[in-house]
């Protein structure tokens, strides 16, 4: 991680890449711990703020503009010799989000996958971006990035991710950048979590009053399992929302979540799924399927749950 | 969104001290740092230095050095300003302003009014 | 010290008026100029950095231009709302220093 002998690691803090208008903590690590240093931008573009100016410990950049985003080096303060400081860090970029209208970003086959599978998320714009970034939240590594492929007037990337280990399992946002300019990124597109399924064991799904019920009749499907399980999610097979909700413990050491489903108008298959909230993205196995069905006349399809949908939230906490 | 959240007003005797908190939220505490500033009645902004909250490295202007020290609290996200031997001339309004080493201050505080009398 | 000198100190506008407030500095400040909106009992409010650019949520009708030591802060067309003091910085070096105001008053 650290540089060589003589070669100080510069490194940013929470990321490198920012968004306009974001503050971003620079930090030079030199023998074995964080000094005076030096500060350099390789354009030699907006560089009045480092002019001969000694930093400590850390820099703190911003509010940025499109002109920080770009390559940096540091050189750690080194008092006995001949210059007084180091050679050069790694190079460290910079990207500046916010530039240009955002690209869309899609998971294939979809953004709930099982442990070991591979995904692919395409980035796409009808801007013509030469590169796409795909970065996820909370990684201070270097965002992927991909050459944009041009069909029909739409740019796009596909990044593979996979095998999918927990690891790799949170939120995505693509970015586009435009030839000329190659770290002043696009706005963000919206947020895609990816989640990961099978890592524990099932729990168990039921209807109240019961699977069959009748129209109009008030359904709640209840999800629960001995394992200490801090949130459920309720899927309905056919739709891209879940309905999450927090466990409660019960009297028997069983943990539960009680999904209200409201008067039943039609039927569907429903799975639930346990997550701890220490990793929202990572999810059990899948229950057995429960099939709940609708006697009567059905009018028109169960109400649309109201939680957020796969697309995002799923990885924020639950608060 | 970004908010800075001052403590209320005060009133001290010559010679007391204070301590003046500043709330951040809606942002990463530690990714910025917190400038002071202080404007006397009918005055203009006087800068009286800044903190960087991610190293909690102070740096104090001239005028400033001795009597005024910034610390912080990273778990509470709080930036706080303490005045020791106070004057009458440094009754004002103390501002927290969210800045870097870049000196901008984008976000401000609402201000707190330290009121020095016998 | 970087000493900013801005003018004027006070100036009446009509609704609609484009209003110029200019700052200079006493050494070369590298474009490292912000502005600032102080209402009355606010604190102040960025409106520019970096000489032009805007802060987020900054309507357009204010524009900020300059290099070297001469900086220009621009109401294209004056509002009631934009009565208020206006201050420069530079942050070019430490310590960060203001110019001494200006008082907009609508007429």
């Known amino acids: 991680l650290m540089g060589g002998q003589d070669k100080p690691f510069l490194s940013a803090r929470p990321s490198t890449v920012v968004p306009r208008g974001g503050h971003v903590a620079l930090q030079c690590h030199y023998r074995r711990g964080f000094n005076n240093f030096m500060l350099y931008k390789e354009d030699r573009s907006h560089v009045p703020i480092f002019h001969g100016r000694i930093f400590q410990e850390s820099f703190i950049m911003g509010p940025v503009t499109p002109a920080h985003a770009g390559t940096y080096r540091c050189r750690g303060s080194r008092p006995h010799s001949l210059t007084g400081w180091s050679a050069p860090s790694n190079p460290l970029v910079i990207m500046v989000t916010g530039n240009h209208r955002k690209p869309s970003l899609l998971a294939h086959p979809g953004p709930l996958l099982k442990s070991g599978e591979t995904v692919i998320l395409q980035c796409w714009s009808d801007v013509m971006f030469e590169h796409f970034f795909l970065h996820r939240e909370g990684i201070s590594e270097d965002p992927s990035r991909l050459v944009g492929q041009i069909h029909d007037g739409v740019s796009k990337a596909n990044f593979s991710i996979g095998p999918l280990m927990p690891v790799l399992a949170g939120t995505y946002r693509c970015y586009g950048s435009v030839p000329h300019s190659p770290y002043q990124l696009s706005a963000p597109s919206d947020p895609l979590d990816i989640v990961i399924t099978g890592l524990y064991e099932k729990p168990s799904l039921s209807a109240q009053p019961g699977p069959t019920v009748q129209a109009g009749e008030n359904v709640t499907l209840s999800c629960s399992s001995w394992s200490s399980y801090d949130i459920y999610h309720l899927s309905r097979e056919g739709e891209a929302h879940e309905r999450r909700l927090r466990a409660v413990p019960k009297v028997n050491r069983t943990f539960q979540a009680d999904f209200p489903l409201g008067p039943a108008t039609h039927g569907g298959t429903y799975r639930c799924f346990g997550s701890f909230r220490a990793l929202p993205c990572v999810w059990s196995n899948s229950s057995d399927p429960l099939l709940v069905s609708v006697t009567g006349n059905p009018s028109s399809s169960w109400p649309s749950p109201t939680e957020p949908s796969s697309k995002s939230g799923i990885c924020r906490h639950l608060h | 969104q970004i908010q800075l959240v001052q403590s209320g007003s005060e009133l001290k005797k010559p010679g007391a001290s204070v301590k003046v908190s500043c709330k951040a939220s809606?942002?990463?505490?530690?990714?910025?740092?917190m400038q002071w500033v202080r404007q006397a009645p009918g005055q203009g902004l006087e800068w009286i230095g800044w903190?960087?909250?991610?190293?909690?490295?102070?740096k104090y202007a001239e005028d400033f050095k001795g009597r005024f020290v910034f610390s912080l609290d990273t778990s509470v996200s709080t930036a706080y300003l303490q005045i020791s031997s106070l004057k009458a001339e440094d009754t004002a309004v103390y501002f927290c302003a969210r800045g870097g080493d870049e000196g901008v201050m984008d976000y401000w505080g609402q201000g707190t009014t330290v009121t020095v009398s016998s | 010290d970087i000493v900013m000198t801005q003018s004027p100190s006070f100036l009446s506008a009509s609704v609609g008026d484009r209003v110029t407030i200019t700052c200079k500095a006493s050494?070369?400040?590298?474009?490292?100029v912000a502005w600032y909106q102080q209402k009355p009992g606010q604190p102040p409010k960025l409106l520019i950095y970096?000489?032009?650019t805007r802060h987020t949520g900054v309507p357009d009708r204010f524009s900020g231009s300059g290099s070297g030591t001469d900086y220009t802060l621009t109401i294209s067309s004056v509002q009631a709302e934009d009565v208020a003091v206006y201050y420069c910085q530079q942050h070019y070096s430490t310590p960060w220093t203001f110019g001494g105001g200006t008082k907009v008053e609508i007429k």
């Open positions: 809606g942002y990463t505490f530690t990714t910025a740092g």
């Open positions: 970096w000489t032009s």
């Open positions: 903190i960087n909250s991610h190293s909690g490295v102070p």
């Open positions: 050494q070369d400040v590298s474009t490292a």
